[in-house]
């Protein structure tokens, strides 16, 4: 006889259920966003639920299908791109991922005027990058590390570069380190506004040391993956920027843009390129020691068809307290006079704010100010500047969109989003049509995400683009955890934290605590965003309290906090997690015998160091794909924050900050170490060295590797990973299965 408890009639509590791990792994409660693919001031494209490509005209209210799902399906297209003259569409299929942003694909060109695919002079395959010119229907593409140009889709191509070689010379696409740590794109070519010129970067990796790892696959012998990957202090790629005239391509060699003398005197990076007009371009350069950045404005000289970058148009940005910029050096947004620009950089009080530069950086006019930070400039029109910041109500983890009227004096500021859906929406991004005639707002939370369309003049909401109704309904019978965002004041440091509490949280009871940490420089974990994820499940079903803490080194709270970790990674980030845990214990509802910490990537490094801190605070912890020594990680990222691993620079701290150096301290904690063997980013080497150090110290630990998986541990590995980590934590916290 099985006795079941009788249901209490109509009890809301009773009809609701906790989240399950299966819910999370199946993505049951994932949300949708709507970003219009703008093609004019008042028109956008969107891929409908049934995969038709539909053109919407906001002003007429009309919509029509420009490309049917049948055409898409005929080549198994997963993506598309309309030419600006609206005569052609490229269809992308056979997507094959490479690194974080890069992938190769097969491209087909569809002629909208005759409803047929363009035959003759078809594109080669696989292509590494392809894009339309901003006007008309010229095509630039990268194939086998060389750039090609087609004046019309059916024309034979002009080969622009000839020296491209796998793993040696990259034209128009970045090498590994530039893709991951500098450009954050799959491309390194840029059309001028009207398509007259095409600028591109050439990366020479000939002298870069190569990381090699086995890819096991299914064959008798594993393959070896070789990637030119400069680790801290190693030889870096050599970058050059060239510009070609696409109206007369490849007649003379591509014209190299000169590097500013103060940059070229030692190792340097190219950081970004911004076209101002068809005959003016802005390049940003960075010294290898990344505290000096130079913005250089260059002009086309018709007579000799060259690019001239006068010293009077060089603007220097230097940091004396840390590195230049935040995570990256910010990019300029030019105004209509095509010489002055708006840019975010630190003000005299050490907060990142918008400045207007007309002649020199020294004479910059500060546009925003306060003990908060401007985060992104979305658009500058003749009379308005749209930006995001975390000013509102002094919550660093929020994002609201503001408009400053620059056409009037004095400029007036208006928060566009602050009071729209105040409880539901505190974290926004935006997408603007040409001339900011219309814009879409995408709200990420803390409530269920919603995307809306607005008039660019009045800010009036025109319509809801996506409100996630199905998700809202699906969550109605789910016991979601409670979330709170608060701050701790400790020794003049403000530590913002997010606490995720079980649904029936009772302050008089004791709960196991899991710290989720990332903690990397210029990151932010405590954000007012919606998420139903693994930690939501741990709180909802397993009754854990989860906390995320933004300590020193994190972003958007001023340079004092951000640059505190400069040249000493692995110290204050760990200290601040520990400090926060102690404060959480003082709150009275944490079972101090059941505290764990986990993190991925930089978070794996911090969690490992926290476990090995010798405080006795943590019973157990997990490190997924951790960095274990900064000597093993990429030069561009590592040196930005740590300087060089040389005796006369910062070698001592490189050595002191390794996980291996603290192997002995793992003796009194339960440690689960996890890594993918095909991690191109944080190499498996990092975990191999931790494991070796622990074995040599005769310290017991648990480990899991994921064969042929990269830094993301995707696919079936994700399910295995979270199941495995759940078992580990439940065992650590003595929770029954």
């Amino acid at each position: 006889i099985v006795l079941r408890p009788s249901r209490v009639h109509n009890s809301e509590e009773n009809t609701m259920r906790a989240l399950t791990l299966k819910d999370i792994l199946n993505g049951t409660f994932s949300y949708k966003t709507f970003f219009p693919n703008w093609i004019s001031g008042q028109e956008y494209l969107h891929q409908s639920a049934d995969n038709n490509i539909v053109l919407y005209n906001i002003e007429t209210g009309q919509s029509y299908t420009i490309l049917s799902n049948r055409t898409m399906k005929s080549v198994n297209a997963s993506n598309y791109g309309l030419s600006p003259d609206r005569q052609f569409v490229y269809l992308e299929s056979d997507y094959s991922k490479l690194w974080r942003y890069s992938y190769t694909a097969t491209y087909y060109i569809y002629d909208l005027s005759n409803g047929e695919f363009v035959r003759g002079n078809e594109l080669p395959r696989p292509i590494q990058y392809l894009c339309w010119s901003p006007v008309g229907s010229k095509l630039a593409y990268v194939y086998q590390n060389n750039i090609y140009l087609k004046q019309r889709p059916g024309d034979p191509p002009f080969q622009i570069t000839f020296n491209g070689r796998e793993n040696k010379i990259f034209n128009g696409i970045p090498d590994w380190v530039y893709e991951e740590e500098m450009l954050a794109t799959k491309y390194a070519l840029w059309w001028s506004p009207n398509g007259k010129f095409l600028a591109y970067a050439e990366f020479n990796d000939t002298d870069i040391p190569v990381i090699a790892y086995s890819y096991y696959g299914d064959e008798q012998y594993p393959r070896t993956i070789n990637i030119p990957y400069p680790k801290a202090g190693a030889k870096n790629p050599v970058v050059r920027i060239f510009i070609i005239d696409t109206t007369y391509p490849a007649y003379v060699g591509p014209q190299e843009v000169p590097v500013p003398a103060m940059i070229a005197s030692s190792d340097y990076y190219f950081s970004w390129l911004t076209w101002v007009t068809d005959e003016r371009v802005c390049l940003q350069w960075l010294k290898r020691v990344q505290n000096v950045s130079v913005l250089s404005i260059c002009d086309f000289r018709e007579d000799w068809q060259t690019w001239d970058c006068p010293k009077t148009q060089e603007h220097i940005e230097e940091s004396r307290t840390g590195w230049a910029g935040g995570f990256f050096v910010s990019t300029p947004v030019f105004s209509y006079d095509a010489i002055s620009y708006y840019k975010i950089f630190s003000d005299k009080d050490g907060y990142k704010h918008i400045h207007y530069i007309k002649d020199t950086v020294e004479n910059a006019i500060q546009i925003t100010s306060g003990k908060w930070e401007a985060i992104n400039i979305f658009r500058v029109t003749q009379d308005s500047l749209f930006y995001s910041s975390n000013e509102f109500e002094e919550y660093p983890g929020r994002r609201n969109i503001y408009r400053i009227s620059i056409g009037s004096y004095p400029p007036s500021k208006k928060c566009v989003t602050c009071h729209l859906r105040k409880e539901r929406c505190q974290y926004y991004t935006a997408s603007f049509s040409d001339y900011a005639k219309y814009y879409a707002l995408v709200c990420y939370g803390p409530g269920i995400p919603i995307s809306t369309l607005h008039d660019g003049r009045t800010d009036q909401e025109i319509k809801i683009l996506e409100e996630n109704k199905e998700l809202e309904n699906a969550l109605k019978n789910i016991q979601l955890p409670k979330e709170e965002i608060k701050k701790l004041e400790v020794d003049e440091i403000t530590l913002w934290y997010k606490m995720i509490l079980p649904p029936q949280f009772d302050r008089s009871k004791k709960y196991p605590l899991l710290i989720q940490v990332y903690g990397g420089p210029c990151s932010q974990s405590v954000r007012s965003v919606f998420a139903v994820n693994w930690i939501s499940y741990l709180a909802s079903k397993e009754g854990m309290v989860i906390a995320l803490v933004d300590g020193r080194g994190t972003a958007f709270q001023g340079d004092k906090l951000l640059y505190a970790v400069y040249r000493k990674l692995g110290v204050y980030e760990v200290e601040d997690q520990i400090t926060a845990v102690r404060k959480f214990i003082e709150m009275g509802f944490i079972d101090e015998k059941r505290i764990a910490i986990w993190g991925w990537s930089y978070g794996g490094y911090v969690s490992s160091l926290a476990l090995a801190s010798g405080t006795g605070l943590f019973k157990c912890g997990i490190a997924v794909a951790p960095v274990s020594s900064w000597e093993y990680y990429a030069s561009v990222y590592t040196e930005r924050f740590m300087g060089l691993p040389t005796k006369d620079d910062n070698l001592e701290h490189y050595k002191n900050s390794t996980v291996m150096a603290r192997a002995e301290y793992f003796r009194n904690v339960d440690y689960l170490l996890i890594h993918g063997t095909a991690d191109d980013n944080v190499h498996f080497q990092n975990s191999a060295q931790i494991a070796k150090a622990l074995v040599n110290a005769q310290v017991d630990f648990q480990a899991m590797w994921y064969s042929d998986q990269n830094h993301g541990l995707s696919g079936l590995s994700t399910n295995h990973l979270y199941t495995h980590m759940t078992h580990f934590l439940k065992q650590c916290f003595s929770l029954s299965d």
Partner: antibody, heavy 120, light 107 residues
Framework: QLQLQESGPGLVKPSETLSLTCTVS??????????WGWIRQPPGKGLEWIGS???????NYNPSLKSRVTISVDTSKNQFSLKLRSVTAADTAVYYC????????????WGQGTTVTVSS | EIVLTQSPATLSLSPGERATLSCRAS??????LAWYQQKPGQAPRLLIY???NRATGIPARFSGSGSGTDFTLTISSLEPEDFAVYYC?????????FGQGTKVEIK
């Protein structure tokens, strides 16, 4: 295979306009991967690039001659032409038309050349 | 504009000998340099493109080398038909320019 043939008067008076035509056979002038250009060689001297044209009609000229030169294309006739205004004796030369594959591949097909004398 | 200086102006050699012709640029032209051969009364003919690549139909005795500012055309063993004037041309910068030529004559 592709062949080029220059035609035009062999004698031009000073201050007048020199006009030459190049006829392309064995291939299309509308190829988007070729340029069509003119080179000249004064008697007993070296080669001088005059200018070139793209099938689209875009042109580029030697700065030293730019004010006097016009190159045009007639795709229907598969021809391109050179006009050099206000000629002097210094413009006396053998004029070659060329198919130019750009900075990498160079000028791979040349006409046999036509001699133009500037004299009254 | 970029000036190309060819040396020597004249090279007197016998058939079967090795000919080494030099072309020096006033500034770097990368590898964007071509070599042309011109026989009396004929149009020039493309020999080498991109500093070191032989054009279609050019015999293997012709080879090009160099990059930046210094380039060399080598004829490993002169044949009677190789006696001609040789021009280098740069395509790196505007406008394209030719060297003044090197005459290879029979000794």
């Amino acid at each position: 295979q592709l062949q080029l043939q220059e035609s035009g008067p062999g004698l031009v008076k000073p201050s007048e306009t020199l006009s030459l035509t190049c006829t392309v056979s064995g291939g299309s002038i509308s190829s988007s991967s070729s340029y069509w250009g003119w080179i000249r060689q004064p008697p007993g001297k070296g080669l001088e690039w005059i200018g070139s044209i793209y099938y689209s009609g875009s042109t580029n000229y030697n700065p030293s001659l730019k004010s006097r030169v016009t190159i045009s294309v007639d795709t229907s006739k598969n021809q391109f032409s050179l006009k050099l205004r206000s000629v002097t004796a210094a413009d006396t030369a053998v004029y070659y038309c060329v198919r130019d594959k750009g900075y990498y591949y160079g000028m791979d097909v040349w006409g046999q050349g036509t001699t133009v004398t500037v004299s009254s | 504009e970029i000036v190309l200086t060819q040396s020597p102006a004249t090279l007197s050699l016998s058939p079967g000998e090795r000919a080494t012709l030099s072309c020096r640029a006033s500034q770097s032209v990368s590898s964007y340099l071509a070599w042309y051969q011109q026989k009396p009364g004929q149009a020039p003919r493309l020999l080498i493109y991109d500093a070191s690549n032989r054009a279609t139909g050019i015999p293997a005795r012709f080879s090009g080398s160099g990059s930046g500012t210094d380039f060399t055309l080598t004829i490993s063993s002169l044949e009677p038909e190789d006696f001609a004037v040789y021009y280098c041309q740069q395509r790196s910068n505007w406008p394209p320019t030719f060297g003044q030529g090197t005459k290879v004559e029979i000794k």
